[in-house]
Interface confidence: medium
């Protein structure tokens, strides 16, 4: 496996589809199955997922999909005869099959010249048949996730094995192991490999101990290691933070609930472009930081950090990473300042109630149409709306 692309080679967004994130192998998923390793095959096109064409579905594609999803191989690769539309049968374990759907003319096909995901390509509008859907049940119902880290790309490492989610012990857990996790999840590369208690402890079995990845493995279960041992408890659950995880902070204000908006993404702190910083984005950030709601969006100062992140929220999201976002690595925010926010929980809001004639207040004009006053001449007040 090649090393993940360094940050300056990636321009991505939450909505892009033509660009595959580091670690992503095939833009496919399985739906309506008994687990993440069985079901109807769907292919990502533009911003939507479309069912894959059943007529062009074969054992090589089935094998490649199962491998790409970290589900082992397809146990049996023969294609079942199309079922009758009235009563589609449940998929046989380990079989590829097609399910009826009358609307799939012009559907995308997954064409593979071998059973490896690198040998596959997605061909749009390839299907010219009776609209059968491709289905597969893979051999290994294995899956991986990061939990309790505030997003899909950070948290406690959990594996699904034998139908149960369980932890990985942090003995010998290092950045190479975390790299494999991040890449497998399509979360870029590992920024941190964390020992136990950085995230909440797990509850289920401990599936792995003494994990020792080279960093080149496609799946965590391909790494050398031992089954979970009795002496490894949940206080030793391994964790990871990947480059695609976003975390936020406010700097330069009176406290953690006021200041310049900074996002940690791909290993560095970035400023956020204020050209798309509206009440809904500010509201989501304040709430996600536990700082109440947004009260002010002061006009920012010039970017002190690399400013490349844009967000667009409807105001109902739990975090900014759930909003539509765009990270532009080739340009700093054009004609933009660094976004700032004052949240309702900031102590500056409660301490700075202006009396009718404020004491020791200096009013300073910074630019036309905007004035800011400095209480006790503290530089933190140099923020403009």
């Amino acid at each position: 496996h090649p090393s993940p692309a360094p940050p300056d080679q990636l321009n991505t967004s939450s909505a892009e589809s033509e660009l595959w994130e580091p670690g992503e192998r095939l833009p496919v998923r399985l739906t309506n199955g008994s687990s993440s390793c069985s079901g109807t095959v769907e292919v990502r096109l533009e911003a939507s997922w479309e069912p894959a064409c059943g007529a062009l579905w074969d054992s090589r594609a089935a094998e490649a999909v199962c491998r790409a999803l970290g589900c082992g191989g397809a146990e049996a690769a023969s294609q079942l005869a199309p079922p009758t539309p009235e009563l589609p049968p449940p998929p046989a374990a380990g079989n590829t099959s097609v399910a009826a759907n009358a609307t799939l003319a012009g559907a995308p096909a997954l064409l593979c010249s071998g059973a490896e995901w690198r040998l596959c390509e997605v061909v749009e509008h390839a299907c010219r048949s009776d609209g059968r859907r491709a289905r597969v049940t893979c051999a290994e119902n294995r899956a991986l996730r990061l939990v309790d880290g505030g997003g899909a790309c950070a948290g406690r490492v959990e594996m699904l094995e034998h139908g149960e989610w369980g932890s990985v012990c942090d003995d010998t857990w290092d950045l190479e192991d975390a790299h494999v996790v991040c890449r497998q999840l399509g979360c870029g590369w590992a920024v941190q490999a964390l020992p136990g208690l950085h995230f909440t402890p797990g509850r289920g079995p401990i599936h792995r101990d003494q994990v020792n990845c080279s960093g080149a493995e496609a799946y965590l279960w391909d790494c050398p290691g031992l089954p979970g041992q009795h002496y490894c408890g949940h206080k030793e659950d391994a964790g990871a933070v990947c480059s695609e995880h976003q975390s936020w902070r406010l700097t330069g204000g009176a406290d953690r609930c006021e200041g310049q908006v900074e996002v940690h993404f791909r290993g560095v702190w970035n400023t956020v472009c204020d050209s798309e910083w509206y009440p809904s984005e500010a509201k989501v950030l304040c709430q996600s930081l536990g700082c109440g709601t947004a009260v002010e969006r002061p006009k920012g100062l010039p970017h002190s950090l690399s400013g490349r992140m844009y967000y667009s929220c409807n105001g109902e999201e739990l975090t900014l990473s759930n909003c539509s976002w765009r990270f532009n690595n080739s340009n700093l925010c054009s004609q933009s300042l660094a976004a700032r926010v004052l949240c309702s929980a900031s102590r500056s809001l409660h301490n700075l109630s202006t009396p009718e004639v404020p004491a020791s207040v200096q009013t300073v004009t910074i630019e036309s149409s905007v004035t800011v006053k400095i209480e006790n001449k503290e530089s933190r007040e140099l923020m403009l709306l």
Partner: antibody, heavy 119, light 107 residues
């Protein structure tokens, strides 16, 4: 019920000063940013000044900068506009307006107080 | 500053007519737009906020639409009580800016 009542308007000579007040009731005054908006006779509405809920952020358009000062007293639930070096073009009805907490628009207005600058 | 271009500046229509007033922002304001109604000698009254949301107590004949730079206020069936001046306000970016107003008269 939200109520905003302006006072302090009147006749003043050019170059003179005047202080407007806006008494707020029916809501938690200290939670809301407040603004003054004016309207000259027969003319469009014009934003004059805004002060944030805690008073730490203050904004003016160029037309009044250096002459007008907005302030607030969150204990007395009152908004003020100190106007000096008044000009004839400052003649207008002055409204105080409350700014919505989430969406930032002016959601409640007072009935206004008339300021006439004339010799 | 964001400029708001409102049109028409005045219009005359009959009771029962459908009337539309438009506002164009100099750049995308992401639906942070409010429509106000002002009657002579009275304070402005909020009709529509966030481009499309009807304010409390406002009759359903008023509606707002639009996104990006272009927005409109529609009165589906004009009533005599609708004689007033209508203003748009963008509140996505400070300084907030207002349209020049549309004076609506009943024929």
């Amino acid at each position: 019920e939200v109520q905003l009542v302006e006072s302090g308007g009147g006749l003043v000579k050019p170059g003179g000063s005047l202080k407007l007040s806006c008494a707020a009731s029916g809501f938690k005054f200290s939670r809301y940013a407040m603004s003054w908006v004016r309207q000259a006779p027969g003319k469009r509405l014009e934003w004059v000044a805004t002060i944030s809920s805690g008073g730490s952020y203050i904004y003016y358009p160029d037309s009044v900068k250096g002459r007008f000062t907005i302030s607030r007293d969150n204990v007395k639930n009152t908004l003020y506009l100190q106007m000096s070096s008044l000009r004839s073009e400052d003649t207008a009805m002055y409204y105080c307006a409350r700014r919505d907490y989430d969406l930032d628009y002016f959601d409640s207005w007072g009935q206004g107080t008339l300021v006439t600058v004339s010799s | 500053d964001i400029q708001m271009t409102q049109s028409p500046s005045s219009l005359s229509a009959s009771v029962g007519d459908r009337v539309t007033i438009t506002c164009k922002a100099s750049r995308d304001i992401r639906s942070y737009l409010t429509w106000y109604q002002q009657k002579p000698g009275k304070a402005p009254k909020t009709l529509i906020y966030y481009a499309t949301s009807l304010a409390d107590g406002v009759p359903s004949r008023f509606s707002g639409s639009g996104s990006g730079q272009d927005y409109s206020l529609t009165i589906s069936s004009l009533e005599s009580d609708d004689t007033a001046t209508y203003y748009c306000l963008q509140h996505g970016e400070s300084p907030f800016t207002l349209g020049s107003g549309t004076k609506l008269e009943i024929k």
